[in-house]
């Protein structure tokens, strides 16, 4: 089973950006994290990015005021991924 983040939190929220913070997992099998942003109630991410396994902070920019966003971080290993850790925030 691919380890899942448990301490994802929001920091530095503005009307157009949201900062994410988490503790990078201590496992040599993890190759990175995928960050996805979905407007709540919509289908596919309006934003996706990949960061290295050592990264524990990310700022999502270009968001629109007054929209609820479901923001997920997924742990990636070779050949698999974790369940998403998801938080919802309105800008």
């Amino acid at each position: 089973e691919v380890p899942q983040l448990t301490d994802l939190s929001f920091v530095d929220i503005t009307d157009s950006s949201i900062g994410l913070r988490w503790t990078p997992l201590n496992s040599s099998t993890i190759i990175g994290y995928r960050i996805t942003v979905v407007a709540a109630g919509e289908g596919i991410p309006i934003f996706e990015d990949f960061v290295d396994s050592s990264v524990g902070y990310y700022t999502v920019t270009g968001l629109e005021p007054g929209i609820d966003y479901d923001i997920s971080v997924i742990t990636l290993i070779n050949g698999g991924e974790s369940a998403p850790t998801t938080l919802t925030q309105q800008t």
């Epitope: 109630g41 919509e42 596919i44 991410p45 309006i46």
Partner: antibody, heavy 116, light 112 residues
Amino acid sequence: QVQLVESGGGLVQPGGSLRLSCAASGFTFSSYGMHWVRQAPGKGLEWVSVISSSGSYIYYADSVKGRFTISRDNSKNTLYLQMNSLRAEDTAVYYCARNKVGFDVWGQGTLVTVSS
Amino acid sequence: DIALTQPASVSGSPGQSITISCTGTSSDGGGYNTVSWYQQHPGKAPKLMIYYVHKRPSGVSNRFSGSKSGNTASLTISGLQAEDEADYYCQAWDNQGMKYVFGGGTKLTVLG
């Protein structure tokens, strides 16, 4: 300016195949999900398929599942729709559209006619 | 799966206001959260008019507004103008069926 241009439509026999392309310009194509939407002559809009910016998320309408394949080449700023086992009911104008919150940019469409 | 139901046609006179409804029904009782609205003139590509229930893209007249109550979304056009005559479609994400869905479309006729 932001633009989507579809191509690849035409006349094809039932059971045949066709590949549609959608060339994007004026924006960072690799940052956006993309849709295919079709409209049969005199009918309403029907969503066909979507692919997320990285290709990690792909969904299809039930009516095309198993026959159509959506893909993208971010290095070429191009979206594709591979259509196999075509049926008469697939006859339509096919539009590509950019995914934001809502489908905010549309191409002019390309006509696909399936007939013997 | 969700089906979005719109009236086939509505009409109004120049200067009047009209409202087009979009009702979501689902076999499992589920609904939809957000909705977008599109305008399509004959022979043209659709144009996004409203997204996320009530938000207007830049460049769209403030005569167009959106709202939602329960499983029914509405598009209201105030101060009707001749160029508003077109087909209008609502669209939503069906989280149960994992697909996007369009309503059947509403033909708006501006009288006179």
